[in-house]
């Protein structure tokens, strides 16, 4: 069965940014990929990010950068602008659409007691659906 | 077809406050940002904030904050954009458009808004 | 902000002439670029995305390129219906738009 694995990380030289990890275990190919933070988009969470393997991609702030770092998974670079987004209690999700698998999302978010540089386990949820 | 349907223009006097809306249709409301842009006459474009629809949202160009209030109502797939305490440089058409992976694909018709006493 | 400076506020030109406008960030916006085009009284229209995409439903006589902080909109056929202004705009970190360039007949 296929897997999605997040991983938030609080960057150690900067307190403010945060990067989420993402990554889909299974067969076939990739199509999109949708990042969402409060919960998964179209549940009441807000799009940050989307990533097309050969359109490029597409971010909204508080995103700064959405990357491919394999073929499937991805990073996405966010700037806590303070008080307004207070990403340290925020779930985060990601959701991998293949073919021809279909959807598969999961979230995760960064661990109450978590030091700079650490991050949550690469574990998926397995609590959220495949469509 | 997709649609952004604004509301019609709007002549006020200095000092108050007007609400625009852009009611949309032909596609998955929630799914989308709604983009507002300022262009006065003759001028460029402008950015005045963002609002995600499924979840409200909502992100401004610094410009415009506390000029400009955002916001949604999903039942009537209607955003709203209020802009407070106008004086004649907020004299401008407003448009609302769909900010999708594409950037801006679909763009309301605009609304004029006259700052004149 | 990232500024989007479009040097060229008026352009002249005749019909079936190829036309290049270009649009220069401030900072690196990788390919996060869209170009619209506006006629009076009209609303924008997207023509472009991720810098050199296509949008459905334009004509191929128009394409984008460039990356980073250099960009360039070509109308390699130009027509008359093409007369209008032309927008950069950047999506990279928040929106901001270029002045436009407004494209005349000579």
């Known amino acids: 069965t296929p897997e999605v694995w997040v991983q938030v990380q609080m960057e150690a030289t900067e307190l403010s940014s945060f990067t989420v990890h993402c990554g889909f275990l299974g067969p076939g190919s990739i199509s999109l990929v949708t990042v969402s933070w409060g919960g998964p988009d179209g549940a009441g969470g807000t799009k940050l990010a989307v990533l097309h393997p050969e359109l490029g991609t597409r971010q909204w702030a508080p995103a700064r950068q959405a990357r491919w770092e394999t073929q499937s998974s991805i990073s996405l670079a966010l700037e806590d602008s303070g008080a307004s987004s207070p990403f340290a209690n925020t779930t985060f999700c990601c959701k991998f659409a293949s073919f021809p698998e279909g959807s598969w999302e999961s979230c995760g978010s960064l661990p109450p007691s978590s030091d700079p540089g650490l991050s949550a386990p690469p574990t998926p949820v397995p609590i959220l659906r495949a469509d | 077809q997709i649609q952004l349907q604004q509301s019609g223009p709007e002549l006020v006097k200095p000092g108050a406050s007007v609400k625009i809306s852009c009611k949309a249709s032909?596609?998955?409301?929630?799914?989308?940002?709604i983009a507002w842009v300022k262009q006065r006459p003759g001028q460029g474009l402008e950015w005045i904030g963002w609002?995600?629809?499924?979840?409200?949202?909502?992100m401004y160009n610094e410009n415009f904050k506390g000029k400009a209030t955002l916001t949604v109502d999903t039942s009537s797939s209607t955003a709203y954009m209020q802009l407070s305490s106008l004086t004649s440089e907020d004299s401008a058409v407003y448009f609302c458009?769909?900010?999708?992976?594409?950037?801006?694909?679909?763009w309301g018709q605009g609304t004029s808004v006259t700052v004149s006493s | 902000d990232i500024v989007m400076t479009q040097s060229q506020k008026f352009m002249s030109t005749t019909v079936g002439d190829r036309v290049s406008i270009t649009c220069k960030a401030s900072?690196?916006?990788?390919?996060?670029v869209a170009w619209y085009q506006q006629k009076p009284g009209q609303s924008p229209k997207l023509l472009i995305y991720?810098?050199?995409n296509r949008y459905t439903g334009v004509p191929d006589r128009f394409t984008g390129s460039g990356s980073g902080t250099d960009f360039t909109l070509t109308i390699s056929n130009m027509q008359s219906e093409d007369l209008a202004d032309y927008f950069c705009?950047?999506?990279?970190?928040?929106?901001?738009f270029g002045a436009g360039t407004k494209l005349e007949l000579k």
């Open positions: 458009a769909r900010d999708s992976f594409y950037a801006m694909d679909y």
């Open positions: 991720s810098a050199s």
């Open positions: 705009q950047q999506y990279s970190t928040y929106l901001t």
């Open positions: 609002i995600y629809l499924g979840s409200g949202h909502t």
């Open positions: 032909g596609y998955t409301f929630t799914d989308y940002y």
């Open positions: 900072q690196n916006v990788g390919t996060a």
